[in-house]
């Protein structure tokens, strides 16, 4: 099944996804979307990178880690219950049917009455499986339905890079990465 990640209402959610560029600066396009990974692209695209930069964002979605080193983990700011569901990370490796795609399930819990750390993130021990599982996730209840239009929001790439990325570094060090080249 999809690897499950949890966050509380009002917190930032973190969905990990990594690859290892074949050479420094030799990036691969990546897209993130709401909904399970379809045959092409990322369903309802919320963020994407190209061979050089992050070139499309939508409100509340950003890359916290160093995407130039292959950390394309998604952060969703200030989540609500509506953010629950399946997300698709697609690493668009050039060639004939080479894409790597991962379905990640985000579960949003109501905020606790007691104060909670503002950057709390809850990961399952199954995280490395996300990066070794190929193909499509199994049946589950979340559906795409009619996909809404997306509004662009300008987000500073520099600000994204300056954000705290220690957790992403820890995850990368676990060796759960896709190697390209």
């Amino acid at each position: 099944s999809e690897v499950e990640y949890r966050a509380e209402v009002g917190q930032n959610a973190y969905l990990p996804c990594f690859y290892t560029p074949a050479a420094p600066g030799n990036l691969v396009p990546v897209c993130w979307g709401k909904g399970a990974c379809p045959v092409f692209e990322c369903g309802n695209v919320v963020l994407r990178t190209d061979e050089r930069d992050v070139n499309y964002w939508t409100s509340r979605y950003w890359l916290n880690g160093d995407f130039r080193k292959g950390d394309v983990s998604l952060t969703i700011e200030n989540v609500t219950l509506a953010d629950s569901g399946i997300y698709c990370c697609r690493i668009q490796i050039p060639g004939i049917m080479n894409d790597e795609k991962f379905n990640l399930k985000l579960v949003i819990k109501p905020a606790k009455v007691t104060p909670a750390p503002t950057r709390q993130r809850d990961f399952t021990a199954a995280f490395p499986r996300m990066l070794t599982t190929r193909g499509h996730g199994p049946a589950e209840t979340q559906t795409l339905g009619s996909l809404p239009d997306i509004n662009l929001t300008q987000i500073s790439t520099l600000a994204n890079e300056l954000r705290d990325s220690r957790l992403a570094n820890d995850l990368r060090d676990s060796g759960a990465t896709i190697r390209i080249g």
């Epitope: 045959v39 695209v45 996909l147």
Partner: antibody, heavy 122, light 107 residues
Framework: EVKLVESGGGLVQPGGSLRLSCAAS????????MAWVRQAPGKGLEWVAN????????YYLDSLKSRFTISRDNAKNSLYLQMNSLKAEDTAVYYC???????????????WGQGTLVTVSS | DIQMTQSPSSLSASVGDRVTITCRAS??????LAWYQQKPGKAPKLLVY???TLAEGVPSRFSGSGSGTDFTLTISSLQPEDFATYYC?????????FGQGTKLEIK
């Protein structure tokens, strides 16, 4: 107005080659995945191949990928299908179709050309 | 491969009838399903995408529903121009696959 116009079909002998073209207009060609879909006489629809925005990624029906090659020229707003080692069972009307766009969302072949007939026969 | 099975294969109906065509996927395809209408000698025309969103210019008598593995296309009141062949198609797994078609004929 979105328009897709196929050309290049015709009669070819088994083992021969053919190159189909599709001229696109009325939309930003480089913002969309493109596809070829075929239909044998009196039969249903069969997907053949897809290509991403810049041509760097391609997708094929497994049984065709060793003989068919999809490509595109965004400067010319054109899509191509190179067909080699043609067989009688490749006889069909070949349609060019516009697929999903750069921001995802709409998963269906929204626009189709009129089709071009390929007949493989000796 | 994901198999798409349509039923019925053919259907006779009269103008004004309500008609439902079903499509079943062999695996979960979420809502990545499209419906097309094709008339003899013509290219297919997109009716519905993402299982339930009506394509631009399609009359509101057409509607799609379903998710996962079971989907339906409904025509609420058949018009003379609706007699055609209808196909479902999934956009979830590779290869993309179509149903075998449902031929809608005049009774």
């Amino acid at each position: 107005e979105v328009k897709l116009v196929e050309s290049g079909g015709g009669l070819v002998q088994p083992g021969g080659s053919l190159r189909l073209s599709c001229a696109a207009s009325g939309f930003t060609f480089s913002d969309y995945y493109m596809a070829w879909v075929r239909q044998a006489p009196g039969k249903g629809l069969e997907w053949v191949a897809n290509i991403n925005y810049d041509g760097s990624s391609t997708y094929y029906l497994d049984s065709l990928k060793s003989r068919f090659t999809i490509s595109r020229d965004n400067a010319k707003n054109s899509l191509y299908l190179q067909m080699n080692s043609l067989k009688a069972e490749d006889t069909a009307v070949y349609y060019c179709a516009r697929d999903v766009g750069y921001y995802g969302g709409n998963y269906g072949f929204a626009y189709w050309g009129q089709g071009t007939l390929v007949t493989v026969s000796s | 491969d994901i198999q798409m099975t349509q039923s019925p294969s053919s259907l006779s109906a009269s103008v004004g009838d309500r008609v439902t065509i079903t499509c079943r996927a062999s695996d979960n395809i979420y809502s990545y399903l499209a419906w097309y209408q094709q008339k003899p000698g013509k290219a297919p025309k997109l009716l519905v995408y993402n299982a339930k969103t009506l394509a631009e210019g399609v009359p509101s008598r057409f509607s799609g529903s379903g998710s996962g593995t079971d989907f339906t296309l409904t025509i609420s009141s058949l018009q003379p121009e609706d007699f055609a062949t209808y196909y479902c198609q999934q956009h979830y797994g590779s290869p993309l696959t179509f149903g075998q078609g449902t031929k809608l004929e005049i009774k």
